[in-house]
C-alpha cells in the first residue's frame, strides 16, 4: 500500500522528458498548493474541480546542476537539523535552534521530523505562535517534539491508520496514507517527503500540528455550536460511541444546520428511535478522511450503511455535491470532525414520499393533490411505483380527477417491497385492490407494461421505484384482445381453425406474435384454403407465433438478440433497436400490448419456423 511512492513514480514518468530525476507536479493557479501527479489528475488537468498547471521540479533527493538538463545531482546528506535548511523549512530550523532542540537532532539517534513549512508557521494563529515564541524552552520545545518520532520512518513505513507515539508525552500522531498518494499526519499533508538525513528523515508538512488530547465525544460536549447535535446524539445513543477508540470522521451539523430543518421533520425523526439512530450514523464514517486527502469525488460508506459522496470544489469540501463544510480538520484522539451547515438525512430516515426526486415531482404532486398522501401513514409500509415526469401526458393530466386517482392508486403498493425482493411472476397488490405482475429480465425489471429505471430507494416506511411509463394493469385476455381488434380477424380465424382458441383464454403467461390482416393480403384464397385444410401444418405455424413466458420489448437489453423457444419448438429471435422490437429482423408494428395472460407484439408478416 505504498501509494506515495507509486504516485511519485508516476510523476517521475511524466517528468522524464525534462531530464533525469524530474518530477511533474500539478499546481492550482493562484495557490501554492502542489501535488505529485496521479494518472487521473494528469489527464483531467484538474484537482478539486480547479484547473492545474504542470510544474517540473527535482524529485525528492535530487538537485539541478548548472548547464545540465534535469536534476542529475543528488542532494547533500546532512543531519536532521541541516536537512531542515536543505528542504527550505528554515522557520522550523530556527525554532529548533531557539528551543535547544538543535543539539538533539544534530547528534546521535534516529528521528523522523514532520517539519512545518515556512508558510505553515505563517498561517498559524498569531496568538498561539506568540505563546510558543515567549516560552521557547518549554512550550516551543514541546510543540516541536510533538512533531517528531524517535525512529526513522519513510512514507513507505507510514501505513494508513497507524497511531505513532510522538516524542512529546507519547501523544499519538494519526497517520493516513491514502490511495491517491496523499500522506497526512494529524491531517497535515506531507508536501515534501523522504528527505533522508544521517540521523533520520525530514518530511515537510503543510501546517503546524496542534496538540490533541480529546475525543470526538469530548469536543461535542464542549462545543456550544453543536448543542443541537449533542442532544440528538444523546437521544440516539450515539454520543458514547464517539468517545471510544477509532478512526472516525464526523460531519457535525451546527445549530444553524438544525434550525434550517422543517420543525415537523426533525420532531418526527427524533421521536423515532430507528430513524434518529440512522440520521446520526449517517454523519459518521469509520475511516479518517482529512480534507487534504480529497482531490475529487469519492464515495464512502457511513455507519448507517448507505454511502455519501465526499468531494471538493476549490478549497471547499463538498458532501453529496454540496458545499457545506464550514470548518474542516478538527483533529481529535479518535478521528476528525468537519463542521457542516446542513443536516444530512439518509433515505432510511425519510418518509416514503420524501424519497421522490426531481424527476418524479409530477407523481408526488398528484399524490398530494388527489388526497392520497394522507393514506401513506408514517406507521404503515408502502411502495411507490413512481413514473418519471414525462410519463404523464397532457391528456392524462387533464383526465377526470376520479379516473386519475384510480390510475395513481395502481402505483402505490400496500407493502414495502425492495428492489432485491422482486421476482419474476410475483403478484403485487395496490392500495386500489388491483393486482400487478412482476417481470424480471436480464437487465430490466418491469411491472405490467412499464419497466424500471435506476434509482430505487428504501425509506423508513416504504420503498420507491422509478418507472418509465404509467403502469396500466391489463383488463382483457389474449383472446379478448384479438377479438376486439379488427386488424387481427384473419389470424383469429386461423387460430380457431387450428383449435387453439382455448389456449389464449386460459390463465397463463404467453408472448404472442400477431400478424395483421395485411400479412395475408398477398396470399391467394387457394393458399389460405390449404392452410386451413392441413390442420397439422396450421397448428405448427400458429404455435410458432406463441412463446411461453411474458417478454416485453422494453425489458430487453437494446441491440442484443434474445433467442426464445416457441411452443412449436423452433427458435424465434427478438431484438430491441431504437425503441422498436425486431422479430426475426422484421420490425414490429406495435409491441407490448399487455393482456391478463400475456403480451402481444404485432407483426405484418406471417412467421414461419426455420
Amino acid at each position: 500500500n505504498n501509494h506515495y511512492d507509486k504516485i511519485l513514480a508516476h510523476s517521475r514518468i511524466r517528468g522524464r522528458d525534462q531530464g533525469p530525476n524530474v518530477c511533474a507536479l500539478q499546481q492550482i493557479l493562484g495557490t501554492k498548493k502542489k501535488y505529485f501527479s496521479t494518472c487521473k489528475n494528469w489527464y483531467k488537468k484538474s484537482i478539486c474541480g480547479q484547473k492545474t498547471t504542470v510544474l517540473y521540479e527535482c524529485c525528492p533527493g535530487y538537485m539541478r546542476m548548472e548547464g545540465m538538463k534535469g536534476c542529475p545531482a543528488v542532494l547533500p546528506i546532512d543531519h536532521v537539523y541541516g536537512t531542515l535548511g536543505i528542504v527550505g523549512a528554515t522557520t522550523t530550523q530556527r525554532y529548533s535552534d531557539a528551543s535547544k532542540l538543535r543539539e538533539e537532532i544534530e547528534g546521535k539517534g534516529s528521528f523522523t521530523y514532520f517539519a512545518p513549512s515556512n508558510e505553515a508557521w505563517d498561517n498559524l494563529d498569531s496568538d498561539i505562535r506568540r505563546g510558543l515564541e515567549s516560552n521557547v524552552n518549554v512550550e516551543l520545545l514541546n510543540a516541536l517534539h510533538s512533531h517528531m518520532i524517535n525512529k526513522r520512518m519513510l512514507t513507505k513505513d507510514l501505513k494508513n491508520g497507524m497511531i505513532i507515539p510522538s516524542m512529546y508525552n507519547n501523544l499519538g500522531l494519526f497517520i493516513n496514507h491514502y490511495p491517491n498518494g496523499v500522506v497526512t499526519v494529524n491531517c497535515a499533508r506531507i508536501i515534501h517527503g523522504n528527505q533522508i538525513a544521517t540521523n533520520g528523515v525530514v518530511h515537510v508538512i503543510d501546517r503546524v500540528l496542534t496538540q490533541i488530547g480529546t475525543s470526538i465525544q469530548d469536543f461535542i460536549e464542549a462545543e456550544d455550536d453543536l448543542s443541537s447535535f449533542r442532544a440528538a446524539a444523546i437521544t440516539s445513543d450515539i454520543l458514547e460511541a464517539l468517545g471510544r477508540d477509532g478512526h472516525f470522521t464526523l460531519f457535525a451539523p451546527t445549530n444553524e444546520a438544525f434550525e434550517k430543518l422543517p420543525r415537523g421533520v426533525l420532531e418526527r425523526i427524533m421521536g423515532d428511535k430507528v430513524a434518529s439512530e440512522a440520521l446520526m450514523k449517517y454523519h459518521i464514517l469509520n475511516t479518517l478522511q482529512c480534507s487534504e486527502s480529497i482531490m475529487g469525488g469519492a464515495v464512502f460508506e457511513t455507519l448507517e450503511g448507505n454511502t455519501i459522496e465526499i468531494g471538493c470544489d476549490g478549497d471547499s469540501i463538498t458532501v453529496n455535491g454540496i458545499k457545506m463544510v464550514n470548518k474542516k480538520d478538527i483533529v481529535t484522539n479518535n478521528g476528525v470532525i468537519h463542521l457542516i451547515d446542513q443536516v444530512l438525512i439518509p433515505d432510511s430516515a425519510k418518509q416514503v414520499i420524501e424519497l421522490a426526486g426531481k424527476q418524479q415531482t409530477t407523481f408526488t404532486d398528484l399524490v398530494a393533490q388527489l388526497g392520497l398522501a394522507s393514506a401513506l401513514r408514517p406507521d404503515g409500509e408502502y411502495t411507490l411505483l413512481a413514473p418519471v415526469n414525462n410519463a404523464f401526458s397532457d391528456d392524462t393530466l387533464s383526465m377526470d380527477q376520479r379516473l386519475l386517482k384510480l390510475i395513481l392508486q395502481n402505483h402505490i403498493l400496500k407493502v414495502k417491497v425492495g428492489l432485491n425482493e422482486l421476482y419474476n411472476g410475483q403478484i403485487l397488490e395496490t392500495i386500489g385492490g388491483k393486482q400487478l405482475r412482476v417481470f424480471v429480465y436480464r437487465t430490466a425489471v418491469c411491472i405490467e407494461n412499464s419497466c424500471m429505471e435506476k434509482g430505487s430507494k428504501q425509506g423508513r416506511n416504504g420503498a420507491i421505484h422509478i418507472f418509465r411509463e404509467i403502469i396500466k394493469p391489463a383488463e382483457k385476455s389474449l383472446h379478448e384482445k384479438l377479438k376486439q381488434d379488427k386488424r387481427f380477424s384473419t389470424f383469429l380465424s386461423l387460430l380457431e381453425a387450428a383449435d387453439l382458441k382455448e389456449l389464449l383464454t386460459q390463465p397463463g403467461d404467453w408472448t404472442l406474435f400477431v400478424p395483421t390482416n395485411d400479412a395475408f393480403k398477398g396470399m391467394t384464397s387457394e393458399e389460405k384454403e390449404i392452410l386451413i385444410r392441413d390442420k397439422n401444418a396450421l397448428q405448427n405455424i400458429i404455435l410458432y407465433h406463441l412463446t411461453p413466458g411474458v417478454f416485453i420489448g422494453k425489458g430487453f437489453e437494446p441491440g442484443v438478440t434474445n433467442i426464445l423457444k416457441t411452443t412449436q419448438g423452433s427458435k424465434i429471435f427478438l431484438k430491441e433497436v431504437n425503441d422498436t422490437l425486431l422479430v426475426n429482423e422484421l420490425k414490429s408494428k406495435e409491441s407490448d400490448i399487455m393482456t391478463t395472460n400475456g403480451v402481444i407484439h404485432v407483426v405484418d408478416k406471417l412467421l414461419y419456423p426455420a
Epitope: L29, Y43, K44, K45, T53
Partner: antibody, heavy 119, light 103 residues
C-alpha cells in the same frame, strides 16, 4: 493520427434545437478534454465549454450555460453539443477541439459545423 | 471571468519584417496562454501553448513570450502566408477566454 470529424451543416428554425457531433479517432477518447468553440461570421472565437469523456465532467461559460449541453458517448468516441432555443445570434460555425495533456492547450481541431438559424 | 485584450485589431507589416502581437490578461494566468492562427474558411491552428512552447510542426519564426498578465506572439521574417488572423487564449482557469483577435 488524431482526427476530429464534425457533423454536417445545420439549418434550423428559431426556437428549435440541434445536436452537433464530433467523432474522435486516433487517440484515447476518454483521457482528453473536448473543447467547443463558437465563431460568428466575421467575428472572433468564443469558448463555449468542455467535457471530460472519462467521467462526463463538464465546464461551461456562464453566458451559454443554458444554451449548450455537452455530452459524450465513450462507446463511439463521439462528443456532442446540443444547442437549444435557437435564435439568430446562434448562427455560427462551431468547432470541437481536443485539449492535449500536460500544459498543452487545444492541439487538434475539427473542421467546424455551420449552424444557420432562420425562419 | 478573465478578460483577454488584444488591443490592436489590425496591424500592418511587410514580408520579411518582424511583428509582435500582444495580449493582456485582466488577472494573473501564470503561463497558461496559447496563440492560434486562423486563415479564412479554415479551423484555427495552434501555434504556441504554455506562453512560449511551439506546437509541433510550427515554424521557428513564431515565438511566444510573457507570463502573468502580459503576453506576446512574435513573428520574425514574416511570410505572405502569415498575413491572417491571430487569437490568444487563456486556459489557466475556467471559463477559458479568447482575445478579440488581431488581423
Amino acid at each position: 493520427q488524431v482526427q476530429l470529424q464534425q457533423s454536417g451543416a445545420e439549418l434550423a428554425r428559431p426556437g428549435a434545437s440541434v445536436k452537433l457531433s464530433c467523432k474522435a479517432s486516433g487517440y484515447s477518447f476518454t483521457h482528453y478534454w473536448m473543447q467547443w468553440v463558437k465563431q460568428r461570421p466575421g467575428q472572433g472565437l468564443e469558448w463555449i465549454g468542455a467535457i471530460y469523456p472519462g467521467d462526463g465532467d463538464t465546464r461551461y461559460t456562464q453566458r451559454l450555460k443554458g444554451k449548450a449541453t455537452l455530452t459524450a458517448d465513450k462507446s463511439s468516441s463521439t462528443a456532442y453539443m446540443e444547442l437549444s432555443s435557437l435564435a439568430s445570434e446562434d448562427s455560427a460555425v462551431y468547432y470541437c477541439a481536443r485539449e492535449g495533456e500536460g500544459n498543452s492547450a487545444m492541439d487538434y481541431w475539427g473542421q467546424g459545423t455551420s449552424v444557420t438559424v432562420s425562419s | 471571468d478573465i478578460v483577454m485584450t488584444q488591443s490592436q485589431k489590425f496591424m500592418s507589416t511587410s514580408v520579411g519584417d518582424r511583428v509582435s502581437v500582444t495580449c493582456k490578461a485582466s488577472q494573473n494566468v501564470g503561463s497558461s496562454v496559447a496563440w492560434f492562427q486562423q486563415k479564412p474558411g479554415q479551423s484555427p491552428k495552434t501555434l504556441i501553448y504554455s506562453a512560449s512552447y511551439r506546437d509541433s510542426g510550427v515554424p521557428d519564426r513564431f515565438t511566444g513570450s510573457g507570463s502573468g498578465t502580459d503576453f506576446t506572439l512574435t513573428i520574425t521574417n514574416v511570410q505572405s502566408e502569415d498575413l491572417t488572423d491571430y487569437f490568444c487564449l487563456q486556459y489557466g482557469t475556467y471559463p477559458y477566454t479568447f482575445g478579440g483577435g488581431t488581423r
